[in-house]
């Protein structure tokens, strides 16, 4: 059974992930972002279901295309280089989803823009955090 300390750690990691995703979304939506139109042409795959931490596998698998899109953006829109930002997210995701069970991600048939993709995972984090508090 999860202890209060492990629940607290999970909550903190989710809050960190949430902040990173929100920072990316804000950087992309920045009205000074000249590459927004181009960035919105990238296709992202959405999970059919995202209700548990194991479903973060679906986010992990999309981190490479996410980095590719961020490489288009001006670096001043973000505090970190895309590679470092994605690396940080990857570390958190790996810790949160755990490596004990191998979960095969199932994707929806429709693709999403980067904005829709980020909003989906922001909602996911907020939802899990709310169940922990």
């Amino acid at each position: 059974a999860p202890t209060s300390s492990s629940t607290k750690k999970t909550q903190l990691q989710l809050e960190h992930l949430l902040l990173d995703l929100q920072m990316i979304l804000n950087g992309i939506n920045n009205y000074k972002n000249p590459k927004l139109t181009r960035m919105l042409t990238f296709k992202f795959y959405m999970p059919k279901k995202a209700t548990e931490l194991k479903h973060l596998q679906c986010l992990e698998e999309e981190l490479k295309p996410l980095e590719e899109v961020l490489n288009l953006a001006q670096s001043k829109n973000f505090h970190l280089r895309p590679r470092d930002l994605i690396s940080n997210i990857n570390v958190i995701v790996l810790e949160l989803k755990g490596s004990e069970t191998t979960f095969m991600c199932e994707y929806a048939d429709e693709t999403a823009t980067i904005v829709e993709f980020l909003n989906r995972w922001i909602t996911f984090c907020q939802s899990i955090i709310s169940t922990l508090t």
């Epitope: 181009r38 042409t41 296709k43 992202f44 795959y45 590719e68 429709e110 693709t111």
Partner: antibody
Framework: EVQLVQSGAEVKKPGESLKISCKGS????????IGWVRQMPGKGLEWMGI????????RYSPSFQGQVTLSADKSISTAYLRWSSLKASDTAMYYC???????????????WGQGTTVTVSS | DIQMTQSPSSLSASVGDRVTITCQAS??????LNWYQQKPGKAPKLLIY???NLETGVPSRFSGSGSETDFTFTISSLQPEDIATYYC?????????FGPGTKVDIK
């Protein structure tokens, strides 16, 4: 090896329909946009349109919109170019090509099929 | 649509010569430009992407430069196997238009 293999040459009469194919291998076919390019005899290259095989999203050049239809079957890693009623002016070599970056079409085309010759004559 | 023009439309040069082709876009395309080589009876081949990046496996005698509306493609030392038609293509805006091509042959 990343490859696009196109269907063989076609000889058709005006008014007939035709569907030519482009099969991808050696890479994740669904993750890259596929473009189609026309080359009329002795002429230059003309960009026709693109399709994303994962969800069959398409973009057409205004010059080809309504003239041709792009489609894809991701289960067999194949993209298609179709005419419902051919004209003599459709006589050309047609190439399919993969967009280099994947996920977005804003990249150049790096891998090309060998081309399919279409001849339309009465 | 963005119009692409190339010059010259054809050229003859000797083996070992430096060959330069220019490509002009009707509006700013940043560095979103490719150069392709098409040999007779063959499919086009990508040589240069993003105006100046050499595609993997392409000989270093090929190079590209330029940004915005004016671009240059150079073969530093022409070889017999370089006989082909060279096309520029923009991918700043749909539709991704090609230049009319430059036919290169040996004197």
């Amino acid at each position: 090896e990343v490859q696009l293999v196109q269907s063989g040459a076609e000889v058709k009469k005006p008014g007939e329909s035709l569907k030519i194919s482009c099969k991808g291998s050696g890479y994740s076919f669904t993750d890259y946009w596929i473009g189609w390019v026309r080359q009329m005899p002795g002429k230059g290259l003309e960009w026709m349109g693109i399709i994303y095989p994962y969800d069959s999203d398409t973009r057409y050049s205004p010059s080809f919109q309504g003239q041709v239809t792009l489609s894809a079957d991701k289960s067999i890693s194949t993209a298609y170019l179709r005419w419902s009623s051919l004209k003599a002016s459709d006589t050309a070599m047609y190439y399919c090509a993969r967009h280099r970056g994947g996920r977005s079409y804003y990249y150049g085309m790096d891998v090309w099929g060998q081309g399919t010759t279409v001849t339309v004559s009465s | 649509d963005i119009q692409m023009t190339q010059s010259p439309s054809s050229l003859s040069a000797s083996v070992g010569d430096r060959v330069t082709i220019t490509c002009q876009a009707s509006q700013d395309i940043s560095n979103y430009l490719n150069w392709y080589q098409q040999k007779p009876g063959k499919a086009p081949k990508l040589l240069i992407y993003d105006a100046s990046n050499l595609e993997t496996g392409v000989p270093s005698r090929f190079s590209g430069s330029g940004s915005e509306t004016d671009f240059t493609f150079t073969i530093s030392s022409l070889q017999p196997e370089d006989i082909a038609t060279y096309y520029c293509q923009q991918y700043e805006n749909l539709p991704f238009t090609f230049g009319p091509g430059t036919k290169v042959d040996i004197k």
